[in-house]
């Protein structure tokens, strides 16, 4: 074990607590320990032990209360199906090892729903969905028997109920009792039986949480006035008169620890970002708690719907704030939420019944004071008139999500607090804070948001292309002339935006190689579309050897790109996507976007360059204020431009200028960076404002970027606001919603 056998801070010796085949770590300053086993193994007979007041560790007891002398890591098995109605499964076995498969078949007259084949996963859970053989005769469809559970009840008429049970030692998550409701839906949520060693994987949590959350926040056209059992997916219309309150409740007790607290804050920042990306502006309440709760943001505050401001408040919260009173009083924390929901003098304000409430609770588990928090959830349901009227139960108006983090989580407690809704999951148990952070990164990246422009996966495990998923590498092979390298940006599923000068009129489509997402394979090109006003030789007679005005081109791909974590579009100016990315009102005009992105001042921006096979972001300032003139004048130092009398002959209104030493020394672009995007990074989103075109000084001779460069080393980029009519015309079928 990694621990010395010295006595911990608590009062229990570590003598003999080792686990065969694994290690242990101390929790709660030595008052508890957790056994850790390699992947595919679990600690037997228990996962955690507590230090008793007698100075000894809690006994190693099996589920049937037999005492074991020494803990050991045992191979994880998946439970076997206790029952399978109206069909057969194969192979039959008392237990199943990781990667074992079973398949399900239905008797004649029955149809299979769910997964016909399921695989035992490394976390002890079966892949896929519960397999159900149903003949479609019942008023409700057969709710199924999730593997590991036992079901009592086989009648599915309106108002019939079924109940579920778990074997001894396993905890039931979800609904123990489900009732067949009007419209053919089952009340509650599908149950499952959890062993203490089972955790939800980040991917599972991200998918389940998001699919439930998007049901709550997506503004989807739906008829209002849902019947009690209306089985349609829970679609909620956020009509202008309705609204949404999201309450973030964060455990700051001793057992959480400072780094976990910071991690949880990161998760919530990502969540706020995610919700904002849907164009929804909920009001936020923000509570941290230990022995007492502390309200940081009230939903009634004017700025509570300003995602940036709420994020700022969240980032400023300090773990130390609860230092002196470090119990875990979840009940008090939920009472703080209740107080935010309730109205003065018990007089409901206009529209109270159109406000949807979402509580997101992150805790490491055990409330150890204040009493049972479930009573407060009941009070909240009462206040919001939920579940009282059979005709209009209003269940859609409250969602309680509980994230249990770490080994001490009491699954029964967190399950009791969480909402239970058909086909949704509101309770999650993750291994540690790192896993929870993964959840929220994955969540930001889920498939529904893949088409959102300018989103990146800023995660410690992310590759270069996770962080710059729009970046495209372009090379043009010219027989006997070597090859030209450029960059570009994915702007839609069929188009990459780059510089026109990367190509000549003689370049054939097959000689142009484009790769995205860091993939080795090249994409097939259909055509390269040049801006009609681009003509590099346009001013040769005037003694200007190369003229880069309108230096933009679009590469049309033969096949549609498949967006994923490493391939996704950058935002273009004057599109609906950018309006949403900047969280501007839907009525925002192109001019207003321009003022937001390119105000008349020095504008912080970035470009992406490849150095030693790695993509790196380079921070620069667009000189768009008082330094603009001097920046543009430095173009005269460019080779071939020394004879130019009026610099506006070469620096047309189409260009943005970066580089130089003021306000900061900007890094410069290299030849291979041409065609790449000049980007403004705002509100965690990336918007392309320019295309890298040409530079005054070649700072990258001999493949090395020079450290010392002259003050007149400037770079010029085509301003996309100046070529919008062309972009709009060529990208008209790409669903970008040009303003």
């Amino acid at each position: 074990t990694p621990w010395s056998l010295a006595r911990p801070q608590g009062s229990c010796s570590l003598e003999g607590v080792e686990i065969k085949g694994g290690s242990f770590r101390l929790l709660q300053e030595g008052q508890a320990l957790e056994y850790v086993c390699p992947s595919g193994f679990y600690p037997y007979p228990v996962q955690t032990r507590t230090c008793r007041s007698t100075g000894s560790w809690s006994t190693l007891k099996t589920q049937d209360q037999k005492t074991v002398r020494k803990a050991e890591c045992r191979a994880i098995h998946c439970p076997r199906p206790h029952d399978f109605e109206n069909g057969e499964y194969w192979p039959r076995s008392p237990y199943y090892n990781v990667s074992d498969e079973i398949s399900f078949h239905c008797y004649d007259g029955y149809t299979l729903r769910g997964s016909a084949n399921r695989t035992c996963q490394v976390n002890g859970r079966w892949s896929g969905q519960t397999a159900i053989c149903d003949n479609g005769a019942g008023y409700c469809s057969n709710p199924g028997i999730p593997i590991g559970t036992r079901k009592v009840g086989s009648q599915y008429r309106l108002e019939d109920s079924v109940t579920y049970h778990c074997s001894r030692g396993l905890t039931l998550r979800g609904s123990q009792r489900r009732t067949c409701q009007e419209g053919g839906s089952w009340s509650g949520t599908e149950p499952s039986c959890q062993d203490s060693f089972m955790y939800d994987t980040p991917q599972e949590v991200a998918e389940a949480f998001l699919s439930s959350l998007t049901e709550t926040i997506e503004g989807v056209d739906a008829e209002d006035g849902h019947g009690p059992g209306e089985q349609q997916k829970r679609k909620i219309v956020l009509d202008p008169s309705g609204s949404m309150n999201i309450y973030l409740v964060l455990d700051g007790s001793d057992s959480i620890g400072a780094s976990n607290f910071t991690g949880a804050k990161k998760c919530l920042v990502n969540l706020i970002e995610k919700v904002a990306s849907y164009g929804v502006k909920p009001r936020y309440g923000l509570v941290t708690y230990a022995t007492y709760p502390k309200i940081w943001v009230k939903v009634s505050e004017a700025d509570s719907s300003n995602a940036d401001w709420v994020t700022k408040q969240l980032n400023e919260i300090n773990y130390e704030d609860h230092k002196l009173k470090s119990g875990t009083n979840t009940k008090k924390a939920l009472q703080a939420v209740y107080s935010m929901m309730s109205w003065p003098d018990d007089v409901p304000p206009e529209g109270w019944n159109r406000t949807r409430h979402v509580i997101i609770l992150m805790t490491d588990g055990l409330h150890n004071m204040g009493g049972d928090p479930i009573t407060v959830i009941d009070e909240i349901r009462d206040l919001l008139y939920i579940g009282k009227d059979r005709k209009n139960p209003r269940e859609d108006y409250l969602d309680v999500y509980v994230f249990g983090v770490g080994p001490l989580v009491n699954q029964v407690n967190i399950n009791a607090l969480a909402s239970k809704k058909d086909n949704e999951q509101h309770v999650f148990k993750v291994k540690d804070m790192e896993n929870l952070e993964d959840v929220f990164y994955q969540m930001i990246d889920e498939s529904q948001s893949l088409s959102l422009c300018g989103m990146v996966w800023e995660h410690r495990k992310g590759t270069d292309y996770h962080k710059q998923p729009w970046q495209a590498k372009i090379s043009v092979i010219r027989p006997s002339k070597g090859h030209e390298s450029c960059m570009g940006a994915v702007v839609s599923e069929y188009f990459v935006l780059t510089a026109a000068h990367c190509f000549t009129v003689d370049d054939k489509e097959h000689s142009i190689k484009v790769s995205v997402g860091g993939e080795k394979r090249d994409l097939e090109i259909e055509v390269v579309l040049f801006h009609p006003n681009y003509n590099i030789n346009g001013k040769k007679e005037a003694g200007i050897p190369e003229f880069y005005d309108y230096d933009v081109a679009l590469i049309k791909l033969k096949n549609k790109l498949k967006y994923g974590q490493t391939i996704r579009p950058i935002c273009l100016p004057c599109t609906e996507g950018t309006t949403r990315a900047l969280r501007l009102p839907p009525t925002t005009t192109c001019q207003q976007q321009k003022e937001e992105l390119l105000p008349a001042q020095d504008i912080k921006a970035l470009f992406v360059s490849e150095e030693e096979k790695k993509l790196t972001r380079k921070e620069v300032y667009i000189k768009n204020g008082d330094k603009k003139g001097s920046c543009e004048r430095d173009a005269q130092y460019a080779p071939g431009y020394d004879k130019v009398k009026d610099i506006s002959e070469v620096v047309t209104p189409r260009f943005l200028c970066t580089g130089g030493v003021s306000p900061y020394a900007d890094p410069n672009t290299c030849r291979g960076d041409s065609g790449g995007p000049l980007i403004v990074h705002k509100r965690s989103r990336f918007i392309q404002v320019g295309v890298i075109s040409w530079g005054v000084v070649d700072v990258c001779k001999n493949q090395k970027r020079q450290k010392q460069v002259p003050a007149h080393a400037r770079d010029f980029h085509i301003n996309l606001f100046q070529v919008l009519p062309w972009l709009k015309e060529k990208l008209q079928d790409e669903d970008l919603g040009f303003l």
């Epitope: 008023y139 009007e182 053919g184 839906s185 349609q232």
Partner: antibody, heavy 120, light 113 residues
């Protein structure tokens, strides 16, 4: 085969009560909900409610709440529907109907009907 | 309550011809997860109790001739008799069981032309 035999026609005064019986045979009485539907002369059909003969649990249409009582006697496989505080617009043929084992919503078997006339 | 509206109120069709009765509900009867429509059709001949013809909007009850068929989804449903027979003269009712109270259409009287 499944049979539902209802009691005979009744004539009642306004304000009185009527109790219609429905005797089931040819199947296990407690396994199937019994539903009551009425039809005023020359009018359409109107669902009144059901009883689960197994548990005795009932579900009534809001319209009849407080006036209707559905009961059963499992020993003689008979379901009853009592309607109180009768009004002239309660004049109708009252049917008992049985659904399927799996789904009580589809009325596959019907009694012959009982005409209840409410008249002063 | 869900209101069921049938059209036409009455219909005269020649023997051997197709008869079509429509039924419209005031809200959707479709369960989108199971793709089932909670609607049934009944036939009632004079002096008799109703008879179940179709359930789940399109599933024919056993023993019902195959000239009877049901179609539609959501809020609009149709009962079709492909070739009218003399014994099909009756009143036809649609019924929703999506929400309580279960409600019937006002009925469509089918006669021979």
């Amino acid at each position: 085969q499944v049979q539902l035999v209802q009691s005979g026609a009744e004539v009642k005064k306004p304000g009185a009560s009527v109790k219609v019986s429905c005797k089931a045979s040819g199947y296990s009485f407690t396994d199937y909900y019994m539903t009551w539907v009425r039809q005023a002369p020359g009018q359409g059909l109107e669902w009144m409610g059901w009883i689960n003969p197994n548990s005795g649990g009932t579900k009534y249409a809001q319209k009849f709440q407080g006036r209707v009582t559905m009961t059963r006697d499992t020993s003689i496989s008979t379901a009853y529907m009592e309607l109180s505080r009768l009004r002239s617009d309660d004049t109708a043929v009252y049917y008992c109907a049985r659904g399927y084992y799996a789904n009580s919503a589809w009325f596959a078997y019907w009694g012959q009907g009982t005409l209840v006339t409410v008249s002063s | 309550d869900i209101v069921m509206t049938q059209s036409p109120d009455s219909l005269a069709v020649s023997l051997g011809e197709r008869a079509t009765i429509n039924c419209k509900s005031s809200q959707s009867l479709l369960n989108s997860r199971t793709s089932k429509n909670y609607l049934a059709w009944y036939q009632q001949k004079p002096g008799q109790p109703p008879k179940l013809l179709i359930y789940w909007a399109s599933t024919r009850e056993s023993g019902v001739p195959d000239r009877f068929s049901g179609s539609g989804s959501g809020t609009d449903f149709t009962l079709t008799i492909s070739s009218l027979q003399a014994e099909d003269v009756a009143v036809y009712y649609c019924k929703q069981v999506y929400n309580l109270p279960w409600t019937f259409g006002q009925g469509t009287k089918l006669e021979i032309k």
